[in-house]
Protein backbone atom coordinates (compact mmCIF):
# COMPACT_ATOMS: atom_id res chain seq x y z
CA UNK A 1 0.00 0.00 0.00
CA UNK A 2 1.45 3.35 -0.99
CA UNK A 3 4.50 1.69 -2.53
CA UNK A 4 5.78 1.50 -6.07
CA UNK A 5 6.70 -1.12 -8.61
CA UNK A 6 9.95 -2.83 -7.71
CA UNK A 7 12.88 -2.99 -10.08
CA UNK A 8 12.40 -6.26 -11.95
CA UNK A 9 14.33 -9.16 -10.42
CA UNK A 10 16.26 -6.91 -8.05
CA UNK A 11 14.95 -8.96 -5.14
CA UNK A 12 15.94 -12.47 -6.24
CA UNK A 13 14.93 -13.93 -2.88
CA UNK A 14 11.28 -12.99 -3.39
CA UNK A 15 8.76 -15.82 -3.60
CA UNK A 16 5.06 -16.02 -4.35
CA UNK A 17 3.36 -18.77 -2.34
CA UNK A 18 0.50 -19.95 -4.52
CA UNK A 19 -2.66 -21.90 -3.90
CA UNK A 20 -4.22 -23.63 -6.90
CA UNK A 21 -2.22 -21.41 -9.23
CA UNK A 22 -3.09 -18.07 -7.64
CA UNK A 23 -0.93 -15.82 -5.46
CA UNK A 24 -1.74 -16.33 -1.80
CA UNK A 25 1.18 -14.95 0.21
CA UNK A 26 4.69 -13.70 -0.05
CA UNK A 27 7.71 -15.75 0.88
CA UNK A 28 11.48 -15.49 0.98
CA UNK A 29 14.07 -17.94 -0.26
CA UNK A 30 16.36 -18.63 2.70
CA UNK A 31 18.17 -21.71 1.35
CA UNK A 32 18.37 -23.48 -1.99
CA UNK A 33 15.42 -25.71 -1.17
CA UNK A 34 13.58 -23.70 1.48
CA UNK A 35 11.19 -20.76 1.47
CA UNK A 36 10.18 -18.96 4.65
CA UNK A 37 6.63 -17.59 4.86
CA UNK A 38 3.83 -17.13 7.41
CA UNK A 39 2.02 -20.04 9.07
CA UNK A 40 -1.42 -18.46 8.77
CA UNK A 41 -1.07 -18.45 4.99
CA UNK A 42 -1.84 -22.15 4.80
CA UNK A 43 -4.64 -22.16 7.36
CA UNK A 44 -7.37 -22.39 4.76
CA UNK A 45 -5.36 -24.26 2.14
CA UNK A 46 -6.84 -27.63 3.18
CA UNK A 47 -6.90 -29.78 0.02
CA UNK A 48 -5.57 -27.13 -2.35
CA UNK A 49 -2.30 -27.43 -4.21
CA UNK A 50 0.44 -25.28 -2.71
CA UNK A 51 3.31 -24.20 -4.97
CA UNK A 52 6.08 -21.63 -4.85
CA UNK A 53 6.90 -19.26 -7.68
CA UNK A 54 10.50 -18.03 -7.82
CA UNK A 55 12.29 -15.65 -10.19
CA UNK A 56 9.14 -13.68 -10.91
CA UNK A 57 8.41 -10.01 -11.33
CA UNK A 58 5.09 -10.29 -13.13
CA UNK A 59 2.72 -12.96 -11.87
CA UNK A 60 1.05 -13.38 -15.27
CA UNK A 61 3.67 -12.61 -17.94
CA UNK A 62 6.24 -15.13 -19.13
CA UNK A 63 9.73 -14.41 -17.83
CA UNK A 64 12.84 -16.53 -18.47
CA UNK A 65 13.75 -16.71 -14.79
CA UNK A 66 10.29 -17.72 -13.56
CA UNK A 67 9.77 -21.20 -12.26
CA UNK A 68 6.97 -22.82 -10.26
CA UNK A 69 8.03 -25.39 -7.68
CA UNK A 70 5.91 -27.99 -5.97
CA UNK A 71 6.12 -28.22 -2.20
CA UNK A 72 7.56 -31.39 -0.73
CA UNK A 73 6.91 -30.44 2.88
CA UNK A 74 5.21 -27.59 4.73
CA UNK A 75 6.48 -26.99 8.26
CA UNK A 76 4.52 -24.44 10.28
CA UNK A 77 6.05 -23.32 13.56
CA UNK A 78 4.78 -25.81 16.17
CA UNK A 79 3.45 -23.03 18.42
CA UNK A 80 1.57 -21.10 15.73
CA UNK A 81 -2.17 -20.91 16.36
CA UNK A 82 -5.05 -19.65 14.23
CA UNK A 83 -6.15 -16.96 16.66
CA UNK A 84 -2.79 -15.34 17.50
CA UNK A 85 -0.07 -13.49 15.62
CA UNK A 86 2.65 -15.22 17.63
CA UNK A 87 5.08 -17.67 15.99
CA UNK A 88 3.58 -16.97 12.57
CA UNK A 89 6.27 -18.71 10.56
CA UNK A 90 6.17 -21.43 7.93
CA UNK A 91 8.99 -23.22 6.15
CA UNK A 92 8.25 -24.72 2.75
CA UNK A 93 10.59 -27.34 1.37
CA UNK A 94 10.64 -27.23 -2.41
CA UNK A 95 10.35 -30.45 -4.38
CA UNK A 96 13.91 -29.86 -5.58
CA UNK A 97 16.69 -27.34 -5.06
CA UNK A 98 15.97 -24.06 -6.78
CA UNK A 99 17.96 -23.25 -9.88
CA UNK A 100 19.96 -20.25 -8.72
CA UNK A 101 20.88 -17.30 -10.90
CA UNK A 102 20.69 -13.49 -11.01
CA UNK A 103 16.91 -13.59 -10.44
CA UNK A 104 16.83 -16.45 -7.91
CA UNK A 105 19.08 -16.24 -4.87
CA UNK A 106 18.63 -16.95 -1.12
CA UNK A 107 18.69 -13.97 1.25
CA UNK A 108 20.92 -13.94 4.34
CA UNK A 109 18.79 -13.82 7.46
CA UNK A 110 19.49 -12.23 10.82
CA UNK A 111 20.79 -14.58 13.50
CA UNK A 112 21.78 -12.02 16.12
CA UNK A 113 18.80 -11.59 18.44
CA UNK A 114 18.91 -7.82 18.80
CA UNK A 115 16.22 -5.30 17.90
CA UNK A 116 16.58 -3.25 14.74
CA UNK A 117 16.99 0.39 15.78
CA UNK A 118 13.77 2.41 15.56
CA UNK A 119 13.81 4.70 12.54
CA UNK A 120 15.82 2.25 10.44
CA UNK A 121 14.38 2.15 6.92
CA UNK A 122 13.54 -1.38 5.84
CA UNK A 123 12.25 -2.73 2.56
CA UNK A 124 9.02 -4.70 2.26
CA UNK A 125 8.03 -6.26 -1.03
CA UNK A 126 5.07 -8.26 -2.23
CA UNK A 127 2.15 -8.78 -4.54
CA UNK A 128 -0.38 -7.75 -1.89
CA UNK A 129 -3.22 -5.31 -2.46
CA UNK A 130 -2.21 -1.76 -3.38
CA UNK A 131 -5.34 0.17 -2.46
CA UNK A 132 -8.30 -0.02 -0.10
CA UNK A 133 -10.50 -1.26 -2.92
CA UNK A 134 -8.39 -4.40 -2.91
CA UNK A 135 -6.63 -4.04 -6.26
CA UNK A 136 -4.04 -6.77 -6.70
CA UNK A 137 -0.94 -5.85 -8.70
CA UNK A 138 0.51 -8.10 -11.34
CA UNK A 139 4.08 -6.94 -10.78
CA UNK A 140 6.08 -6.94 -7.58
CA UNK A 141 5.67 -3.82 -5.43
CA UNK A 142 7.87 -2.53 -2.64
CA UNK A 143 7.95 0.17 0.01
CA UNK A 144 10.50 1.51 2.48
CA UNK A 145 9.19 1.67 6.03
CA UNK A 146 10.78 3.00 9.24
CA UNK A 147 11.00 0.57 12.14
CA UNK A 148 8.84 1.60 15.11
CA UNK A 149 9.88 1.03 18.71
CA UNK A 150 8.00 -1.69 20.57
CA UNK A 151 6.73 0.55 23.38
CA UNK A 152 4.91 2.77 20.89
CA UNK A 153 3.57 -0.25 19.05
CA UNK A 154 2.26 -1.67 22.34
CA UNK A 155 0.22 1.41 23.23
CA UNK A 156 -3.50 0.93 23.79
CA UNK A 157 -4.23 2.99 20.68
CA UNK A 158 -1.89 0.80 18.63
CA UNK A 159 -1.49 -2.95 19.25
CA UNK A 160 -2.23 -2.84 22.97
CA UNK A 161 0.43 -5.10 24.40
CA UNK A 162 0.37 -7.71 21.63
CA UNK A 163 3.93 -7.06 20.47
CA UNK A 164 6.22 -9.52 22.20
CA UNK A 165 10.01 -9.50 22.00
CA UNK A 166 9.70 -11.94 19.09
CA UNK A 167 7.80 -9.41 17.00
CA UNK A 168 8.68 -6.00 15.59
CA UNK A 169 6.72 -3.14 14.08
CA UNK A 170 7.12 -0.76 11.19
CA UNK A 171 5.26 2.48 10.59
CA UNK A 172 2.04 2.32 8.63
CA UNK A 173 1.15 5.90 7.78
CA UNK A 174 -0.36 5.43 4.30
CA UNK A 175 2.61 3.28 3.28
CA UNK A 176 2.21 -0.25 4.61
CA UNK A 177 2.25 -3.97 3.94
CA UNK A 178 -1.25 -5.33 3.38
CA UNK A 179 -3.38 -8.35 2.49
CA UNK A 180 -1.42 -10.66 0.22
CA UNK A 181 1.95 -9.42 1.50
CA UNK A 182 1.84 -11.80 4.47
CA UNK A 183 4.81 -14.13 4.61
CA UNK A 184 6.94 -11.69 2.67
CA UNK A 185 10.29 -10.25 3.79
CA UNK A 186 11.17 -7.17 5.80
CA UNK A 187 14.75 -6.47 4.74
CA UNK A 188 17.01 -4.08 6.62
CA UNK A 189 20.51 -3.39 5.36
CA UNK A 190 20.35 -6.31 2.94
CA UNK A 191 19.48 -8.81 5.69
CA UNK A 192 16.14 -10.49 6.37
CA UNK A 193 14.94 -9.19 9.73
CA UNK A 194 11.22 -9.88 9.67
CA UNK A 195 8.39 -11.75 8.02
CA UNK A 196 5.06 -10.01 7.42
CA UNK A 197 2.51 -11.50 9.83
CA UNK A 198 -0.74 -12.68 8.37
CA UNK A 199 -3.28 -11.57 10.95
CA UNK A 200 -6.15 -9.47 9.58
CA UNK A 201 -5.23 -5.84 10.15
CA UNK A 202 -6.32 -2.50 8.79
CA UNK A 203 -3.62 -1.24 6.38
CA UNK A 204 -2.22 2.24 6.03
CA UNK A 205 -3.54 3.45 9.38
CA UNK A 206 -0.87 5.24 11.42
CA UNK A 207 -2.27 3.83 14.66
CA UNK A 208 -2.10 0.22 13.49
CA UNK A 209 1.54 -0.39 12.59
CA UNK A 210 2.63 -3.34 10.49
CA UNK A 211 3.65 -6.37 12.55
CA UNK A 212 6.58 -8.55 11.55
CA UNK A 213 7.93 -11.77 13.04
CA UNK A 214 11.59 -11.35 13.99
CA UNK A 215 13.50 -14.15 12.30
CA UNK A 216 16.48 -13.85 14.67
CA UNK A 217 14.21 -14.91 17.50
CA UNK A 218 13.52 -18.16 15.64
CA UNK A 219 17.06 -18.97 14.50
CA UNK A 220 17.19 -22.25 16.41
CA UNK A 221 13.89 -23.45 14.93
CA UNK A 222 14.83 -22.44 11.38
CA UNK A 223 18.19 -24.16 11.70
CA UNK A 224 16.60 -27.32 13.08
CA UNK A 225 14.13 -27.57 10.19
CA UNK A 226 16.72 -26.82 7.53
CA UNK A 227 19.23 -29.28 9.00
Amino acid sequence: LGGREAEAHARPYMASVQLNGAHLCGGVLVAEQWVLSAAHCLEDAADGKVQVLLGAHSLSQPEPSKRLYDVLRAVPHPDSQPDTIDHDLLLLQLSEKATLGPAVRPLPWQRVDRDVAPGTLCDVAGWGIVNHAGRRPDSLQHVLLPVLDRATCNRRTHHDGAITERLMCAESNRRDSCKGDSGGPLVCGGVLEGVVTSGSRVCGNRKKPGIYTRVASYAAWIDSVLA
Epitope: P118, D149, A151, N154, R155, R156, D160, G161
Partner: antibody
Amino acid sequence: EVQLVQSGAEVKKPGASVKVSCKASGYTFTSYYMYWVRQAPGQGLEWIGEINPYSGGTNFNEKFKSRATLTVDTSTSTAYLELSSLRSEDTAVYYCAREGGFAYWGQGTLVTVSS
Amino acid sequence: DIQMTQSPSSLSASVGDRVTITCKASQNVDTDVAWFQQKPGKAPKGLIYSASSRYSGVPSRFSGSGSGTDFTLTISSLQPEDFATYYCQQYNNYPLTFGQGTKVEIK
Protein backbone atom coordinates in the same frame (compact mmCIF):
# COMPACT_ATOMS: atom_id res chain seq x y z
CA GLU B 1 3.81 -11.99 37.34
CA VAL B 2 3.81 -8.31 36.40
CA GLN B 3 4.32 -5.95 39.32
CA LEU B 4 4.79 -2.21 39.72
CA VAL B 5 6.15 -1.42 43.17
CA GLN B 6 6.29 2.21 44.22
CA SER B 7 8.38 3.96 46.85
CA GLY B 8 7.02 4.86 50.27
CA ALA B 9 5.05 7.86 51.49
CA GLU B 10 6.73 11.26 51.58
CA VAL B 11 6.13 14.42 53.58
CA LYS B 12 7.50 17.58 51.99
CA LYS B 13 7.50 21.29 52.70
CA PRO B 14 6.06 23.78 50.19
CA GLY B 15 8.64 24.72 47.56
CA ALA B 16 10.52 21.43 47.92
CA SER B 17 10.76 18.62 45.37
CA VAL B 18 9.79 14.98 45.60
CA LYS B 19 10.96 11.97 43.57
CA VAL B 20 8.70 8.92 43.43
CA SER B 21 9.99 5.63 42.04
CA CYS B 22 8.15 2.76 40.35
CA LYS B 23 10.03 -0.52 39.97
CA ALA B 24 8.68 -2.81 37.27
CA SER B 25 9.10 -6.58 37.13
CA GLY B 26 7.62 -9.51 35.26
CA TYR B 27 7.85 -7.97 31.78
CA THR B 28 10.31 -6.27 29.45
CA PHE B 29 10.46 -2.74 30.84
CA THR B 30 11.39 -1.06 27.55
CA SER B 31 8.45 -2.60 25.68
CA TYR B 32 5.75 -0.45 27.29
CA TYR B 33 5.22 3.22 28.05
CA MET B 34 4.78 4.10 31.71
CA TYR B 35 2.32 6.79 32.69
CA TRP B 36 1.70 8.66 35.92
CA VAL B 37 -1.61 9.65 37.49
CA ARG B 38 -2.40 11.42 40.72
CA GLN B 39 -5.43 11.52 42.99
CA ALA B 40 -5.92 14.25 45.56
CA PRO B 41 -7.78 13.22 48.74
CA GLY B 42 -11.43 12.54 47.94
CA GLN B 43 -10.93 13.62 44.32
CA GLY B 44 -10.76 12.01 40.91
CA LEU B 45 -7.86 10.83 38.76
CA GLU B 46 -5.56 13.23 36.92
CA TRP B 47 -3.05 12.23 34.24
CA ILE B 48 0.39 13.79 34.71
CA GLY B 49 2.36 12.39 31.79
CA GLU B 50 4.09 9.36 30.31
CA ILE B 51 7.52 8.13 29.28
CA ASN B 52 8.76 5.72 26.66
CA PRO B 53 11.42 3.71 28.53
CA TYR B 54 13.06 2.67 25.27
CA SER B 55 13.70 6.17 23.95
CA GLY B 56 13.22 8.33 27.02
CA GLY B 57 10.64 10.38 25.10
CA THR B 58 7.93 12.02 27.21
CA ASN B 59 4.46 13.51 26.87
CA PHE B 60 2.99 15.74 29.56
CA ASN B 61 -0.25 17.23 30.70
CA GLU B 62 0.41 20.93 30.08
CA LYS B 63 -0.55 21.61 33.69
CA PHE B 64 2.54 19.74 34.93
CA LYS B 65 4.98 20.38 32.11
CA SER B 66 7.04 23.01 33.94
CA ARG B 67 7.28 21.12 37.24
CA ALA B 68 7.30 17.41 36.42
CA THR B 69 10.27 15.37 35.22
CA LEU B 70 9.90 11.78 34.08
CA THR B 71 12.94 9.55 33.84
CA VAL B 72 13.80 5.85 33.73
CA ASP B 73 16.69 3.65 34.72
CA THR B 74 16.52 0.72 32.33
CA SER B 75 19.23 -1.17 34.21
CA THR B 76 16.90 -1.49 37.21
CA SER B 77 13.59 -1.31 35.31
CA THR B 78 12.56 1.70 37.35
CA ALA B 79 10.56 4.77 36.36
CA TYR B 80 10.73 8.02 38.28
CA LEU B 81 8.46 11.01 38.70
CA GLU B 82 10.00 14.15 40.14
CA LEU B 83 7.71 17.05 41.00
CA SER B 84 9.26 20.36 41.96
CA SER B 85 8.03 23.60 43.58
CA LEU B 86 5.54 21.65 45.64
CA ARG B 87 2.45 23.33 47.02
CA SER B 88 -0.27 22.12 49.36
CA GLU B 89 -2.57 21.24 46.45
CA ASP B 90 0.00 18.68 45.27
CA THR B 91 -0.92 16.54 48.27
CA ALA B 92 -2.14 13.38 46.59
CA VAL B 93 -1.56 9.70 45.95
CA TYR B 94 0.68 9.31 42.90
CA TYR B 95 0.32 6.19 40.76
CA CYS B 96 2.43 4.72 37.98
CA ALA B 97 0.65 2.55 35.42
CA ARG B 98 1.76 0.52 32.42
CA GLU B 99 0.41 1.72 29.09
CA GLY B 100 -0.75 -1.19 26.95
CA GLY B 101 -1.85 -4.76 27.50
CA PHE B 102 -3.39 -5.51 30.88
CA ALA B 103 -3.97 -2.44 33.07
CA TYR B 104 -1.22 -2.80 35.64
CA TRP B 105 -0.95 -0.05 38.27
CA GLY B 106 1.42 0.55 41.14
CA GLN B 107 0.05 0.57 44.68
CA GLY B 108 0.36 4.34 44.93
CA THR B 109 2.61 6.73 46.86
CA LEU B 110 1.11 9.30 49.20
CA VAL B 111 2.88 12.66 48.97
CA THR B 112 1.88 15.14 51.66
CA VAL B 113 2.88 18.77 51.25
CA SER B 114 2.61 20.65 54.51
CA SER B 115 4.44 23.43 56.28
CA ASP C 1 -8.39 19.09 26.50
CA ILE C 2 -11.11 16.51 26.01
CA GLN C 3 -13.64 16.60 28.85
CA MET C 4 -15.14 13.30 29.96
CA THR C 5 -18.45 13.98 31.64
CA GLN C 6 -19.64 11.07 33.71
CA SER C 7 -23.16 10.61 35.04
CA PRO C 8 -24.53 10.13 37.53
CA SER C 9 -21.89 11.28 40.03
CA SER C 10 -23.33 8.81 42.52
CA LEU C 11 -26.09 6.24 42.69
CA SER C 12 -27.67 3.92 45.23
CA ALA C 13 -28.52 0.40 44.14
CA SER C 14 -29.28 -3.02 45.55
CA VAL C 15 -27.57 -6.35 44.98
CA GLY C 16 -28.96 -7.84 41.77
CA ASP C 17 -29.80 -4.48 40.21
CA ARG C 18 -28.78 -3.53 36.71
CA VAL C 19 -26.58 -0.43 36.84
CA THR C 20 -25.68 1.85 33.94
CA ILE C 21 -23.06 4.59 34.04
CA THR C 22 -22.55 6.93 31.10
CA CYS C 23 -19.59 8.97 29.95
CA LYS C 24 -19.76 11.71 27.33
CA ALA C 25 -16.61 12.98 25.59
CA SER C 26 -16.42 16.60 24.49
CA GLN C 27 -15.12 15.43 21.09
CA ASN C 28 -14.78 12.23 19.12
CA VAL C 29 -12.45 9.70 20.77
CA ASP C 30 -13.33 6.74 18.51
CA THR C 31 -13.37 3.71 20.83
CA ASP C 32 -10.31 4.75 22.82
CA VAL C 33 -12.06 4.58 26.18
CA ALA C 34 -11.32 2.52 29.28
CA TRP C 35 -13.31 1.98 32.47
CA PHE C 36 -11.75 1.53 35.91
CA GLN C 37 -13.08 0.43 39.27
CA GLN C 38 -11.58 1.86 42.44
CA LYS C 39 -12.16 0.88 46.03
CA PRO C 40 -11.10 3.08 48.96
CA GLY C 41 -7.35 3.05 49.59
CA LYS C 42 -6.66 0.92 46.50
CA ALA C 43 -5.29 1.57 43.03
CA PRO C 44 -7.78 1.64 40.15
CA LYS C 45 -8.46 -1.71 38.51
CA GLY C 46 -9.03 -1.98 34.75
CA LEU C 47 -12.40 -3.33 33.69
CA ILE C 48 -12.89 -2.38 30.04
CA TYR C 49 -10.63 -1.16 27.23
CA SER C 50 -11.37 -0.13 23.64
CA ALA C 51 -14.85 0.86 24.87
CA SER C 52 -16.21 -2.68 24.92
CA SER C 53 -13.44 -5.26 25.51
CA ARG C 54 -13.20 -6.80 28.98
CA TYR C 55 -9.81 -7.21 30.61
CA SER C 56 -9.00 -10.82 31.42
CA GLY C 57 -10.38 -11.89 34.79
CA VAL C 58 -13.16 -9.29 34.78
CA PRO C 59 -16.59 -10.88 35.38
CA SER C 60 -18.95 -11.00 32.40
CA ARG C 61 -21.54 -8.93 34.27
CA PHE C 62 -19.40 -5.90 33.37
CA SER C 63 -19.85 -4.67 29.81
CA GLY C 64 -18.99 -1.54 27.91
CA SER C 65 -20.39 0.01 24.77
CA GLY C 66 -20.21 3.13 22.66
CA SER C 67 -18.02 4.95 20.19
CA GLY C 68 -17.37 8.52 19.17
CA THR C 69 -18.58 10.61 22.10
CA ASP C 70 -21.05 8.46 24.06
CA PHE C 71 -20.00 5.54 26.21
CA THR C 72 -21.70 3.28 28.72
CA LEU C 73 -20.56 0.89 31.44
CA THR C 74 -23.22 -1.62 32.47
CA ILE C 75 -23.21 -3.98 35.46
CA SER C 76 -25.92 -6.49 34.62
CA SER C 77 -26.46 -7.79 38.15
CA LEU C 78 -24.78 -5.83 40.93
CA GLN C 79 -22.79 -7.93 43.40
CA PRO C 80 -21.67 -6.92 46.92
CA GLU C 81 -18.06 -6.55 45.76
CA ASP C 82 -19.10 -4.09 43.02
CA PHE C 83 -19.78 -1.22 45.41
CA ALA C 84 -16.99 1.18 44.46
CA THR C 85 -16.21 4.26 42.40
CA TYR C 86 -16.03 3.90 38.61
CA TYR C 87 -14.04 6.10 36.23
CA CYS C 88 -13.97 6.37 32.46
CA GLN C 89 -10.78 7.44 30.70
CA GLN C 90 -10.13 8.54 27.13
CA TYR C 91 -6.73 7.75 25.65
CA ASN C 92 -7.31 9.01 22.13
CA ASN C 93 -5.74 12.42 22.66
CA TYR C 94 -3.26 14.20 24.92
CA PRO C 95 -3.66 14.84 27.70
CA LEU C 96 -5.35 11.60 28.71
CA THR C 97 -8.41 12.53 30.74
CA PHE C 98 -10.73 10.82 33.21
CA GLY C 99 -14.36 11.30 34.06
CA GLN C 100 -15.02 12.69 37.53
CA GLY C 101 -16.16 9.30 38.81
CA THR C 102 -19.42 7.59 39.75
CA LYS C 103 -19.78 6.27 43.27
CA VAL C 104 -22.00 3.18 43.48
CA GLU C 105 -23.40 2.85 46.99
CA ILE C 106 -25.60 0.31 48.73
CA LYS C 107 -29.26 1.29 48.87
